[in-house]
Structures are given as structure tokens and as C-alpha cells.
């Protein structure tokens, strides 16, 4: 049902859904801190623009009695319950910042007449693609998929002279929310990734993964997985690995690889790590002081959601336009705004663009080094290290099919 919005006469409210089920197990207090820090900045920016208005946030908590798994499994109903709560209280703001679980976002989008924008820190799954009033501030699965296809096809770099068309995907069901949807997208038979590959098999058991590492009859040399180095070690241990195996470890929200004193463990030598270009580990604001890198990215997305709303509010107010209109609801896309950690670019569908970085372990220095970067906005790869000190023969990535190329 239509809910009146607290969004006019110089007073603009943000509805923040504080859900017990969340993409990352983050204390809600930290998210509140991020939102409040964002509000201070937005108020200052509006004042600087000569706009004398009030901006506040209302935090909407669920009772947590029914939906208390803490992860995203029971988030679908929690999101709808919160919306019902907002509806009953007639307390809808100009914008909804909140659901981070793909399940809840998808269902809320489906079950409501959204005449207001929805900003999500998460909602990684393909089912949340191409939603007209949804903005996602953490890299969704579609962006990962496009990188992988681009990289698989690349064959004109000094260190990659073969196009690839095959892959194994390791997915055992214990993944974090981001990894779950990233791998889900790769697994889906109708996805762009599956469409572009000639062979793709999902490995669901540890033993399947372990067997492939030395199986002479394997159908691909490339294995994609998602998680951190410790996750890989638990699975792989110190097992021998065929020399033409390439493991692609997707670990987007982790900038530990860029820290000065980090040495790559030996088991990472056959691994290419895909992560995001680092911000700074110097984030020292009240909300980020005690956060792990992943959780900092999550809290940062909440803060940037507030800054994005402030950016759009400022534009509409300066142009004398109404905020409670479909035009405003559909405007949170195809733009760049000044985020907390630098410029943030949203694509035509409201999804954040970023620079992905592919790292390798240097056999000389045992350090992680940047092999290439990929700009999701233009779907383009930029080689960085033209002479990588790889573990693979001739310092080239092997062919993806055993028995061909440098072995």
C-alpha cells in the first residue's frame, strides 16, 4: 500500500532498516555510527550549498523473535515485516537504506510498489540485477561475471596467450553471503559466464576439489573459488598441485594483500587472487576503527548510501524539483558522487563500479603483486606487470586444457 513519506517542507528523512539477518555479521551499532557520520557530512554539504533543510535518519529494528538466524536464510520475511512496520507507523522516509540480503531485497522489491529509492549494501545476486529503483553499493555478482569472461577470453598479454573456455567452480554451501551469490551466478546455467564457457563443472565436496589438483584426466586446469587464503588452506593444505593448475581465489572485500608486511604463504603460489583496489587501511573514523576489512567495506557502503542520498537531494532541491516523485526514485544511477573514500560511480542500473585487481604471488619475493586491473565501468582489462615472476612455466599462464600450451 502507498505510505506517506516524511519527505517535504524542508524536512527529509532516511529510513534505515536495521535487520537482524544481514550479509555480514556486523553489530548494528557500527552501522548506526556509519549512518550518523554520513548524516553529519550531508548536513554540512547541504549547508555549504545554501540549502537550509533538515536531514535525519529513522532506524527501523525488527523484533528479532522470529527471524534470528543472523545470516540471510530467514531474511525474506524479516524485510517484509519491517516494511509492514513502516506502513503501520506511516513512517516512510524519502529513501530506504537497508536490506543487504539478496533474498530480502528481491522480495521487498517484488512485493511493494516502490515509488521511493532503495539503497543496498549487498544484494549481490543476479536476481537483484536491473531493478529500476535499487542501488547497490557493493560489487554485485554481475560485475564479477563480466570480469571473468573478459579475462577468460584475453589472449594477447605477454603472460596470457591462450583464451580459456573451461573452468571448475568450487562451491560447498558454507560460503559467506557475498561468495554464495558470486558462485551462484557462475553456477547458474543461464548466466553470461555459463553461456560463454564450453565446459564448467561445480565441485561440491572437499574431496572432489582435492582430487582435481592431481587428476591427469581433469577437463580444466582452472578452478574458481571464493574466500580468503585460510579458507583455501583448510581445503588444500600442503597437497601437491599439478604445475598447470590455476586457482582463481575471489576475495573482493579484503585488502590485507596490500599491507606492507604481508608475505604470501607457499600454498598461494598457484593462486591468482581477485580483490578490489584498496582504499586505505588508515580509515580512522569512529565507525571503522575496530572493523575487519570486509566489515569496513560493509559499513562504508552504509555511509556512502547516506552520502548518495545527500547528493541526489542537493541536486533536486537546487533544481526546485519534488523529492516524492518517480523521477527522484529512478535517479540514483548513471552518476558519480564524492563518497567517503573517494569518488563512487554508479552504472546505468545503479550498481557500483570499481577497479578489480588480480594478484599473483611472486616466486622471487613471496609478496602479492598486481598482475592486472579491471575497470568494471568500461569492462576493460589493464595489464600492470608485463614480466610477472610466476610459478607457471615460462612466466605465462597455462592453457586451460591439459596437454596443450606451456606445461
Amino acid at each position: 500500500s502507498q505510505v506517506s513519506q516524511n519527505c517535504h517542507n524542508g524536512s527529509y528523512e532516511i529510513s534505515v532498516l536495521m535487520m537482524g539477518n544481514s550479509a555480514f555479521a556486523e553489530p548494528l551499532k557500527n552501522l548506526e555510527d556509519a549512518v550518523n557520520e554520513g548524516l553529519e557530512i550531508v548536513r554540512g554539504r547541504l549547508q555549504n550549498a545554501g540549502l537550509n533543510v533538515t536531514v535525519n535518519a529513522t532506524f527501523m529494528y525488527s523484533d528479532g523473535l522470529i527471524h534470528n538466524s543472523g545470516d540471510c536464510r530467514s531474511s525474506t520475511c524479516e524485510g517484509l515485516d519491517l516494511l509492514r512496520k513502516i506502513s503501520n507507523a506511516q513512517r516512510m522516509g524519502c529513501v530506504l537504506i537497508g536490506p543487504s540480503c539478496t533474498y530480502s531485497t528481491f522480495q521487498m522489491y517484488l512485493d511493494t510498489e516502490l515509488s521511493y529509492p532503495m539503497i543496498s549494501a549487498g544484494s549481490f545476486g543476479l536476481s537483484c540485477d536491473y531493478k529500476e529503483t535499487l542501488t547497490r553499493l557493493m560489487s554485485p555478482a554481475r560485475k564479477l561475471m563480466y570480469f571473468l569472461v573478459n579475462f577468460w577470453k584475453t589472449n594477447d598479454l605477454p603472460f596470457k596467450t591462450y583464451s580459456w573456455s573451461t573452468s571448475y567452480v568450487y562451491k560447498n554451501g558454507t560460503e559467506t553471503e557475498d561468495c554464495f551469490w558470486y558462485l551462484n551466478a557462475l553456477e547458474a546455467s543461464v548466466s553470461y559466464f555459463s553461456h560463454e564457457l564450453g565446459f564448467k563443472v561445480v565441485l561440491r565436496q572437499d574431496k572432489e576439489f582435492q582430487d582435481i589438483l592431481m587428476d591427469h584426466n581433469r577437463k580444466s586446469n582452472v578452478i574458481i573459488m571464493c574466500g580468503g587464503p585460510e579458507f583455501l588452506y583448510k581445503l588444500k593444505g600442503d597437497r601437491a598441485v599439478a604445475e598447470d593448475i590455476v586457482i582463481i581465489l575471489v576475495d573482493l572485500f579484503n585488502d590485507q594483500y596490500f599491507e606492507d608486511n604481508v608475505t604470501a604463504p607457499d600454498y598461494m603460489k598457484n593462486v591468482l587472487v581477485l580483490t578490489l583496489s584498496p582504499g586505505n587501511s588508515l580509515l580512522n573514523s569512529s565507525f571503522s576503527r575496530n572493523l575487519s576489512p570486509t566489515k569496513r567495506d560493509f559499513a562504508l557502503a552504509y555511509l556512502n548510501g547516506i552520502l548518495l542520498f545527500g547528493h541526489m537531494l542537493k541536486i533536486f532541491l537546487e533544481n526546485g524539483e519534488n523529492i516524492t516523485t518517480p523521477k527522484f526514485a529512478h535517479a540514483f544511477r548513471n552518476l558519480t558522487f564524492e563518497g567517503y573514500d573517494g569518488p563512487v560511480t554508479l552504472d546505468d542500473w545503479g550498481d557500483v563500479d570499481s577497479t578489480m585487481v588480480l594478484l599473483y604471488t611472486s616466486v622471487d619475493t613471496k609478496k602479492y603483486k598486481v598482475l592486472l586491473t579491471y575497470d568494471t565501468h568500461v569492462n576493460k582489462t589493464y595489464p600492470v606487470d608485463m614480466s610477472p615472476t610466476f610459478t607457471w612455466k615460462n612466466s605465462k599462464l597455462p592453457n586451460d586444457i591439459t596437454g596443450r600450451g606451456p606445461q
Epitope: 554539504r45 563518497g339 573514500d341
Partner: nanobody, 119 residues
Framework: QVQLVESGGGLVQPGGSLRLSCTSS????????MDWYRQAPGKQREIVAT???????TYSDAVKGRFTISRDNAKDTVYLQMNSLKPEDTAVYYC?????????????WGQGTQVTVSS
């Protein structure tokens, strides 16, 4: 109207150091990032360093490892510490703050401070 005032420029020998300051009449450094630019005689104005709200910093290749940008919110001041100065660092240095415009430069400029590196 936001005012930015640079100071700290001067004449210095190659290899020497200077610290530039940019002070604001408002809280602009607490709500937007800030850039230092420089313009050498007969050349285009070029970006030198940026500091964002989070404290994240970026530098042009020409100054990386030699210059450090920092901020003191309590004093509404941003600094540019310049070490190992070279003759090619000679330029007028400007601070640029506020909301980025369509051309990526920010709203407000200071009047500039001259840095001359010469023996």
C-alpha cells in the same frame, strides 16, 4: 563564501623540504575531499595530491614517495609536506576544495603560494 588560504611557499635548494598549509574559513575539509594542484610557468595546472574524508590519499607519479598530504580537522587545515625537492617542482601551488564539478576540479580555489627550487 568559502575562502582557502595557502602558505608555506618559498625558495629552497634541491633536496630540501617545505611544508605548505591550506587553511579554510569553514568546515569544508570535513565534508569533502581536498586536492593540491600546481602550475609551472607556461604549463598546464596539474594535480599533485588528494586526501579524501576517510584519510585515503593519492599522489601523482611525479611526487609519489616524496610528498605527503595530511589533514588536521580541528584546525580546518590541510598540509602538503614536500621532501627531496627538485627544480622541476618549481610552481605555484594551489589548494582546491569542495564539491567536484563536472570537470572534476572542486568548487573553491586558494590564491596560490609560490615554491621555487633552485641552487
Amino acid at each position: 563564501q568559502v575562502q582557502l588560504v595557502e602558505s608555506g611557499g618559498g625558495l629552497v635548494q634541491p633536496g630540501g623540504s617545505l611544508r605548505l598549509s591550506c587553511t579554510s574559513s569553514s568546515n569544508i575539509f570535513r565534508i569533502y575531499g581536498m586536492d593540491w594542484y600546481r602550475q609551472a610557468p607556461g604549463k598546464q595546472r596539474e594535480i599533485v595530491a588528494t586526501i579524501y574524508l576517510s584519510g585515503r590519499t593519492t599522489y601523482s607519479d611525479a611526487v609519489k614517495g616524496r610528498f605527503t598530504i595530511s589533514r588536521d580537522n580541528a584546525k580546518d587545515t590541510v598540509y602538503l609536506q614536500m621532501n627531496s625537492l627538485k627544480p622541476e617542482d618549481t610552481a605555484v601551488y594551489y589548494c582546491n576544495a569542495g564539491e567536484p564539478t563536472a570537470s572534476s576540479v572542486r568548487q573553491y580555489w586558494g590564491q596560490g603560494t609560490q615554491v621555487t627550487v633552485s641552487s
